[in-house]
Amino acid sequence: KFSKQSWGLENEALIVRCPRQGKPSYTVDWYYSQTNKSIPTQERNRVFASGQLLKFLPAAVADSGIYTCIVRSPTFNRTGYANVTIYKKQSDCNVPDYLMYSTVSGSEKNSKIYCPTIDLYNWTAPLEWFKNCQALQGSRYRAHKSFLVIDNVMTEDAGDYTCKFIHNENGANYSVTATRSFTVKDEQGFSLFPVIGAPAQNEIKEVEIGKNANLTCSACFGKGTQFLAAVLWQLNGTKITDFGEPRIQQEEGQNQSFSNGLACLDMVLRIADVKEEDLLLQYDCLALNLHGLRRHTVRLSRKNPIDHHS
């Protein structure tokens, strides 16, 4: 639970924070888990502990492994684990997935790309930024503090962005690089009157008595993030929860975003052990948003079991 993955490249600085937090006054002890060997605190060592931080200056492939940190509070010794992997530098430009930090999304209005983990390091501006291994040049790109700002973002700006900076430790400089993907999202969303894709209006659904049946209410509401949108089922004009039949339950399906970018929702109505009286009910699929409400009605009919003897 209190475990964290960290990674870096050989011959670069890597600083890892203990996954357990604590007051600055708390003592933190670090161990190499495989050998239970204590990590020294003296800065003359290439790998040393400094409170909540474990520093590899610089990192080596052989440093890979699990490190244990124990935060000693007045009441408890709290244990965390740092799973560290150091990779060899790639000769080609491609940054493999395992070296990637979380993807960030941007839009025309907001195009900040933060340099991952930089707050752990003692660095000085400016940061260097690269996209797909090419140094970024031009007035559209502005390195500001620990992030990159892109003016007038376009879909072509999507890609892998690498920040490069220098960590300084007692006068010695160490290089650090970190890469993350940037995606561009279209903010030109809109909302429209709900469109129910299923069921069809006045659809007759065949069911077998004694078996289970599922009805899916599916509707689309526009493009992009919708402020208010819902799909639900009613029985004889009554909410499912108020109808009071435990055999009949509705279950939210997956939010769907189709290839055309429409924002759609599903609601599945599950009927367990279908009974004769279920055929007498009116099943309404309702889709509503700020534009209004649309209703499609479904009725159930008995499906005659196949007579295998005829």
Epitope: R20, K23, N77, R78
Partner: antibody
Framework: QVQLVQSGAEVKKPGASVKVSCKAS????????MYWVRQAPGQGLEWMGA????????AFNQKFKGRVTMTADKSTSTAYMELSSLRSEDTAVYYC??????????????WGQGTMVTVSS | DIQMTQSPSSLSASVGDRVTITCSAS?????MHWYQQKPGKAPKRLIY???KLASGVPSRFSGSGSGTDYTFTISSLQPEDAATYYC?????????FGQGTKLEIK
């Protein structure tokens, strides 16, 4: 929201034991240590000890060591505090409590409603 | 054990007054927490880490201090502030509380 619900009031004879329960909800029980604080009638607050529900590790105020047992049941998200060899001065309201941010020990932010334990012959 | 001494042990003040409670620790502590308790109720955290205001707590409450001497202040006393106030240290085992300051409204 975080809730700590304690068991009801108890009346015990001197020399007996009492076991107070504290059922947690609204958060992951094993993510936060549970602390126990008591308050005698008209008196101040006194920390008794704590348990880490994840590991079962305990920390005690030496004053109570040997008399207090703290346990946690992960399956029911319930912490227990048992005090043995009761004497009249153990008459108090017993509270379970936890910090807001466990690792930063930032004060007791959440409290149970308290359990009144009366020790009387 | 670190002993916490609060002063005064009780005080009476008028609505709108500025009220100050002090807490002196027998050894140096890194942080102080402050609680409010009303009769029949569990304590409520007001200030944590010496000077940080807990969520939902009015800004008239504040805290300061370092080392062995800490202060809790109510800038403008309100009728609902009648209660007992406790300081607490979390720097050393056992965790200890002050004996409390009972605040009455005149």
């Amino acid at each position: 929201q975080v809730q700590l619900v304690q068991s009801g009031a108890e009346v015990k004879k001197p020399g007996a034991s009492v076991k107070v329960s504290c059922k947690a909800s609204g958060y992951t029980f094993t993510d936060s240590e549970m602390y126990w604080v008591r308050q005698a009638p008209g008196q101040g607050l006194e920390w008794m000890g704590a348990i880490d529900p994840e590991t079962g590790d305990t920390a005690f105020n030496q004053k109570f060591k040997g008399r207090v047992t703290m346990t946690a049941d992960k399956s029911t998200s319930t912490a227990y505090m048992e005090l043995s060899s009761l004497r009249s001065e153990d008459t108090a309201v017993y509270y379970c409590t936890r910090a807001f941010d466990n690792d930063n020990d930032d004060g007791f932010a959440y409290w149970g409603q308290g359990t009144m334990v009366t020790v009387s012959s | 054990d670190i002993q916490m001494t609060q002063s005064p042990s009780s005080l009476s003040a008028s609505v709108g007054d500025r009220v100050t409670i002090t807490c002196s620790a027998s050894s140096s502590v890194n942080y102080m927490h402050w609680y409010q308790q009303k009769p029949g109720k569990a304590p409520k955290r007001l200030i944590y880490d010496t000077s940080k205001l807990a969520s939902g707590v009015p800004s008239r409450f504040s805290g300061s201090g370092s080392g062995t001497d800490y202060t809790f202040t109510i800038s403008s006393l309100q009728p609902e502030d009648a209660a007992t106030y406790y300081c607490q240290q979390w720097s050393s085992n056992p965790l200890t509380f002050g004996q409390g300051t009972k605040l009455e409204i005149k």
